[in-house]
Interface confidence: low
């Protein structure tokens, strides 16, 4: 299913974070929280779907705790009073590790998926349409929070694209929060009129099913590889591309290509067999000189989830992995609007693509 009319993502918001959910929660809304659990401080973090910013009315409190072997608390707070806890005595998060946390709002419940796997269902205790705010606090660093509204009419192909009906600023500025932590470049508030989120839904109401026999659907967000899609309007300064996924346990390599016709304007190629992140450009089937330097160790890890944020600027692409700036790549193909195709392939599972 394609998603459109979604609000722009919050990129690398500082924690604690509170942000508006434009239009409130709706049946079918999917909210993805991508980040990394901090390894140093604290034993808890929480994602709250709430009314307003006070924290007195929380429809869904999702609270992983690295205590007593690890467990996750789910609860609801009404008029400042907590209800009975629901505990899941399994911890799908790891300290120091990135995660992809997806909330699907449905008529009867929230479905929560962690790194592509259904983790818990939380049945509504209060009407979800009252929720207009998402907040995140605790020992976590955020890469992004994105919003995906299902179309009222299902269409194919799944990555059909529809522009926003209203221009939006990208990213919207979180209310009353401090600036981003060092290491992540500042947001560019230039207006963007088209943002497309490419997601996979197996079938209406069956997003997370994993039948024992080969099903006739994609059981949870898993993109066929290679994943290829158009970048509406091509690249331009301030244009962002977001991808998240999981590296396969036996991965050798994967690639993210930004293409212009038959040329690969930007080839991002993490190689686990060489412990390198190779960048290059291919013009008329000829590769240029590779760039491999990194400011820190290889950020991609076999078996671990990741997020990649590519920000186009006038002279270069800036690439951040798991919310941390990794490198700049100066444009070799400078006709940016013609760079209008994204190709992803190799030994990864994609869970989220936003162009």
């Amino acid at each position: 299913m394609a998603f459109s009319g979604s609000q722009a993502p919050y990129l690398s918001p500082a924690v604690p974070f509170s942000g508006t959910i434009q239009g409130g929660l709706q049946d079918g809304l999917q909210i993805t929280v991508n980040g990394t659990v901090l390894s140093s401080s604290g034993t808890r973090f929480a994602v709250n779907f709430q009314t307003g910013f006070s924290g007195n009315d929380i429809a869904f409190h999702f609270n992983p705790r690295f205590e007593d072997g690890g467990y996750v608390v789910c609860n609801t707070r009404q008029n400042g009073s907590w209800g009975p806890e629901e505990r899941k005595t399994h911890m799908p998060f790891q300290k120091g590790m990135p995660f992809d946390l997806c909330f699907l709002v449905q008529s009867s419940d929230f479905k929560v998926m962690v790194n592509g796997i259904l983790f818990v269902q939380y049945f509504h205790r209060v009407p979800f349409h009252r929720v207009d705010t998402i907040s995140v606090n605790g020992s976590v660093q955020l890469s992004y929070i994105s919003f995906q509204n299902p179309r009222t009419v299902p269409v194919q192909p799944a990555f059909s694209t529809v522009p926003f009906s209203q221009p939006v600023c990208f990213p919207p500025r979180p209310r009353g929060r401090r600036q981003k932590p060092p290491g992540v470049w500042p947001a560019n508030p230039a207006p963007i009129t088209q943002t497309v989120i490419h997601t996979v839904q197996s079938a209406p109401g069956q997003m997370f099913s994993t039948p024992a026999i080969p099903p006739m659907m994609y059981p949870h967000p898993a993109y066929p590889m290679p994943f290829i899609t158009t970048i509406l309007g091509g690249l331009y300064p301030s244009k962002s591309i977001l991808l998240s996924g999981t590296v396969l346990p036996s991965a050798q390599r994967f690639h993210i290509n930004l293409c212009s016709g038959n040329h690969i304007a930007f080839h991002l190629n993490p190689r686990f067999d060489e412990n390198a992140v190779v960048r290059n450009t291919q013009i008329d089937n000829s590769w240029g000189s590779e760039e491999r330097s990194l400011p820190r160790k290889m950020p991609f890890v076999r078996g671990q989830s990741f997020s990649v944020w590519i920000l186009c600027e006038a002279h270069c692409l800036k690439v951040a992995v798991d919310g941390q700036h990794l490198f700049e790549y100066y444009h070799r193909l400078r006709n940016l609007p013609t760079i209008n195709r994204l190709e992803v392939g190799g030994d990864i599972q994609l869970t989220h693509v936003q162009t």
């Epitope: 080969p214 099903p215 006739m216 898993a222 066929p224 590889m225 392939g345 030994d347 599972q349």
Partner: antibody
């Protein structure tokens, strides 16, 4: 029971066109990957084209790119291979096959791969003057 | 494109023999390799996927393994119904998909 039945093969002159059909039953083409593979007489297997209907994604071997088009009619649960500008070297038995659904119970990574678990019986295409 | 070099092109063996067929990829293909069996006039049948996973319903005498860019199909004890042609296939980075040239297993 999963079944794939090809049809549409036959004798055609060089430069001519043919449309092969692959009628599927026992599964839904919309949510699967369908692949065409050919085998020239006495030769090995050659992958031709693939489609993931759900995503509108199509892929082609270099040898047929620009001449062949893979498509699917989900209402008929049928995939097609439209073959134009046919050449003598396109003579082969054409098989349609379904990609294997690889369920990653441990990794959580499940996908339709190009490992082909169900095949049709094949249809012969002869390009000759 | 990634090439799959299959060897031997043919072999003669007896019932009960252990048979090994190898495919070497021209570059790393991770574990994205499958093996098929084809009998004359019939469509191929999937035996192994992801280099070493036995496809449902395939006898356990068939096995697959990987060492770097070398992939091996082993038939631990050849049965009369196993005389056929075997193909390897790779899909690393998924497209283009390529097959090995085939190995014909004949009766000695």
């Amino acid at each position: 029971e999963v079944q794939l039945v090809e049809s549409g093969g036959g004798l055609v002159q060089p430069g001519g066109s043919l449309r092969l059909s692959c009628a599927a039953s026992g599964f839904t083409v919309s949510y699967s990957s369908i692949h065409w593979v050919r085998q020239a007489p006495g030769k090995g297997l050659e992958w031709v084209a693939s489609i993931y209907s759900y995503y509108g994604s199509t892929y082609y071997a270099d040898s047929v790119k620009g001449r062949f088009t893979i498509s699917a009619d989900t209402s008929k649960n049928t995939a097609y291979l439209q073959m134009n500008s046919l050449r003598a070297e396109d003579t082969a038995v054409y098989y349609c096959a379904r990609g294997h659904y690889q369920e990653g119970r441990k990794s959580g990574f499940s996908y339709w791969s190009p490992a082909l678990d169900y095949w049709g019986q094949g249809t012969l295409v002869t390009v000759s003057s | 494109d990634i090439q799959m070099t299959q060897s031997p092109s043919s072999l003669s063996a007896s019932v009960g023999d252990r048979v090994t067929i190898t495919c070497r990829a021209s570059q790393s293909v991770s574990s994205a390799v499958a093996w098929y069996q084809q009998k004359p006039g019939k469509a191929p049948k999937l035996l192994i996927y992801s280099a070493s996973s036995l496809y449902s319903g395939v006898p356990s005498r068939f096995s697959g393994s990987r060492s770097g860019t070398d992939f091996t199909l082993t038939i631990s004890s050849l049965q009369p119904e196993d005389f056929a042609t075997y193909y390897c296939q790779q899909w690393y980075w998924y497209y283009p998909v390529t097959f090995g040239q085939g190995t014909k297993v004949e009766i000695k």
